[in-house]
């Protein structure tokens, strides 16, 4: 018996070939012997089966002795043995129809689980293997699960259903809802304007939800909500904002926040959360602000940084075009009795400068100038 695999919703063509290469009488029946389709001369006739409105045949091939049964918009319950009777020949074809669907939704939040469920006819014992857009393979039976979805899992999943050494392939588009970056860090000199951007890693027609930025300043004992906002069809509207600092927010995506001035008291870490309509869970992006200040008080030139810096970062004070006078893996460095000239305070990571602040030290009889 020939086995043919079909996909739910697709069209399948079952073939039946007569030994004589001419148009003769034929009919297709199911396992209950119910007539599905046949011919009367050059006319196509349909039987009383439940497939009535979904079957057809290629009439152009009849006179070559080919009598196809075309079944459109396949359903799992179309799985059956189909019998073609043509002349004194009888051919049997077993059709197995499979469907593969993603749990509830194909738009899932980063960190959530994806479950792919195989619909299969009774009595079948298929195996399924799926490949993610980053090439990861998973294997299973009637269900396949991937826990902790990552951003790279967004895209087309290719799944192969194997049954009786035959295969049918499904492609499912999965969208992982997440910010492009899990975390970002902004380095600013005191007084500079700060821009925070939170680009999304996906695009959808309509995007509705609400969000909030909580901030834990390094100098503060507890975190506080800096801003809350709504998102309606990709339009952003601010609901509530603190008075200090008075953040400004862009009205369009990507989510964009502006802090008028970088000040030591604002240095710290923030967590922007976005709750999307009809989705359980929230999207998160961490943002960090590091602020630098260079000052001269009497005979002491000091450079300080505030905010979440890694222990491997180097803070240095140097006179322009000269070797560093002081370099430490600390958050403050100073030079006593600095000589006159343009001093540079540098925060660097393995030689790469992340932040720089210049301060002009005047001869001792005058006051310092901060450019």
């Amino acid at each position: 018996k020939k086995v043919v695999l079909g996909k739910k919703g697709d069209t399948v063509e079952l073939t039946c070939t007569a030994s004589q290469k001419k148009s003769i009488q034929f009919h297709w029946k199911n396992s209950n012997q119910t007539k599905i389709l046949g011919n009367q001369g050059s006319f196509l006739t349909k039987g009383p089966s439940k497939l009535n409105d979904r079957v057809d045949s290629r009439r152009s091939l009849w006179d070559q002795g080919n009598f196809t049964l075309i079944i459109k918009n396949l359903k799992i319950e179309d799985s059956d043995t189909y019998i073609c009777e043509v002349g004194d020949q009888k051919e049997e074809v077993q059709l197995l129809v499979f469907g593969l669907t993603a749990n509830s939704d194909t738009h899932l939040l980063q960190g959530q689980s994806l479950t792919l469920t195989l619909e299969s006819p009774p009595g079948s014992s298929p195996s399924v293997q799926c490949r993610s857009p980053r090439g990861k393979n998973i294997q299973g039976g009637k269900t396949l699960s991937v826990s902790q979805l990552e951003l790279q899992d967004s895209g087309t999943w290719t799944c192969t259903v194997l049954q009786n050494q035959k295969k049918v392939e499904f492609k499912i588009d999965i969208v992982v809802l997440a910010f492009q970056k899990a975390s970002s860090i902004v380095y600013k000199k005191e007084g500079e304007q700060v821009e925070f951007s939170f680009p999304l890693a996906f695009t959808v027609e309509k995007l509705t939800g609400s969000g909030e930025l909580w901030w834990q300043a390094e100098r503060a004992s507890s975190s506080k909500s800096w801003i809350t906002f709504d998102l309606k069809n990709k339009e952003v509207s601010v609901k509530r904002v603190t008075q200090d600092p008075k953040l400004q927010m862009g009205k369009k995506l990507p989510l964009h926040l502006t802090l008028p001035q970088a000040l030591p008291q604002y240095a710290g870490s923030g967590n922007l959360t976005l709750a999307l309509e009809a989705k359980t869970g929230k999207l998160h992006q961490e943002v960090n602000l590091v602020v630098m200040r260079a000052t001269q008080l009497q005979k002491n030139l000091t450079c300080e940084v505030w905010g979440p810096t890694s222990p491997k970062l180097m803070l240095s004070l140097k006179l322009e075009n000269k070797e560093a006078k002081v370099s430490k893996r600390e958050k403050a460095v100073w030079v006593l009795n600095p000589e006159a000239g343009m001093w540079q305070c540098l925060l660097s990571d393995s030689g790469q400068v992340l932040l720089e602040s210049n301060i002009k030290v005047l001869p001792t009889w005058s006051t310092p100038v901060q450019p």
Epitope: Q129, C130, R131, R134, G135, K136, N137, T156, T158, T160, K167, V168, E169, K171
Partner: antibody, heavy 117, light 107 residues
Framework: EVQLVQSGAEVKKPGESLKISCKGS????????IGWVRQMPGKGLEWMGI????????TYSPSFQGQVTISADKSISTAYLQWSSLKASDTAMYYC??????????WGQGTLVTVSS | DIQMTQSPSSLSASVGDRVTITCRAS??????LAWYQQKPEKAPKSLIY???SLQSGVPSRFSGSGSGTDFTLTISSLQPEDFATYYC?????????FGQGTKLEIK
């Protein structure tokens, strides 16, 4: 019987363009990925990338991204590998293979590409 | 990228010998490993998939084992037609990568 038949050997000059082919038969060409593998003279196998002829979805190895283009014409069950400007270092044997979710179960006979001035 | 390291690079053996080739992945690849055989001037041929499943038509003297990072290909009793180069390949994540090959020669 599953078969992948590749186009014949090519001798080209540096800077020239080239498109080699791989024709599949004996199976549903649109239902499997097709991969390309490079083997430089006396060396091992290198995975270049794959294409799904059903919708021309492609994935490249970072080493070959931008160096070659993989395409397919499902109407004639043929996959292609092409270069816009060949280099001497492109001299190699190129194989196409049917990709069964990562495993290359059937291979073409290979196309030898020689680039020399 | 996941690096695949085969050992030994070459191996001399006699007909009837039992031979083992190993393949190590730079990170865990579950059982997503294939073994191929390549004879001079020929295309590679698939022998083993999913680390231990024998491709249809491949003689049962070939077997594969392992999971995670360490894998082996064993030929229980070498036949004259088995002298060739063998490659392992991971297909756990893109880009799928091959080992550098093990050349099996007649002693």
């Amino acid at each position: 019987e599953v078969q992948l038949v590749q186009s014949g050997a090519e001798v080209k000059k540096p800077g020239e363009s080239l498109k080699i082919s791989c024709k599949g038969s004996g199976y549903s060409f649109t239902g499997y990925w097709i991969g390309w593998v490079r083997q430089m003279p006396g060396k091992g196998l290198e995975w270049m990338g794959i294409i799904y002829p059903g919708d021309s979805d492609t994935t490249y190895s970072p080493s070959f991204q931008g160096q070659v283009t993989i395409s397919a014409d499902k109407s004639i069950s043929t996959a292609y590998l092409q270069w816009s400007s060949l280099k001497a270092s492109d001299t190699a044997m190129y194989y196409c293979a049917r990709d069964q979710l990562g495993l290359f179960d059937y291979w073409g006979q290979g196309t030898l590409v020689t680039v020399s001035s | 990228d996941i690096q695949m390291t085969q050992s030994p690079s070459s191996l001399s053996a006699s007909v009837g010998d039992r031979v083992t080739i190993t393949c190590r992945a730079s990170q865990g690849i579950s059982s997503w490993l294939a073994w191929y055989q390549q004879k001079p001037e020929k295309a590679p041929k698939s022998l083993i998939y999913s680390a231990s499943s024998l491709q249809s038509g491949v003689p049962s003297r070939f077997s594969g084992s392992g999971s995670g990072t360490d894998f082996t290909l064993t030929i229980s009793s070498l036949q004259p037609e088995d002298f060739a180069t063998y490659y392992c390949q991971q297909y756990d994540s893109y880009p799928y990568t091959f080992g550098q090959g093990t050349k099996l020669e007649i002693k």
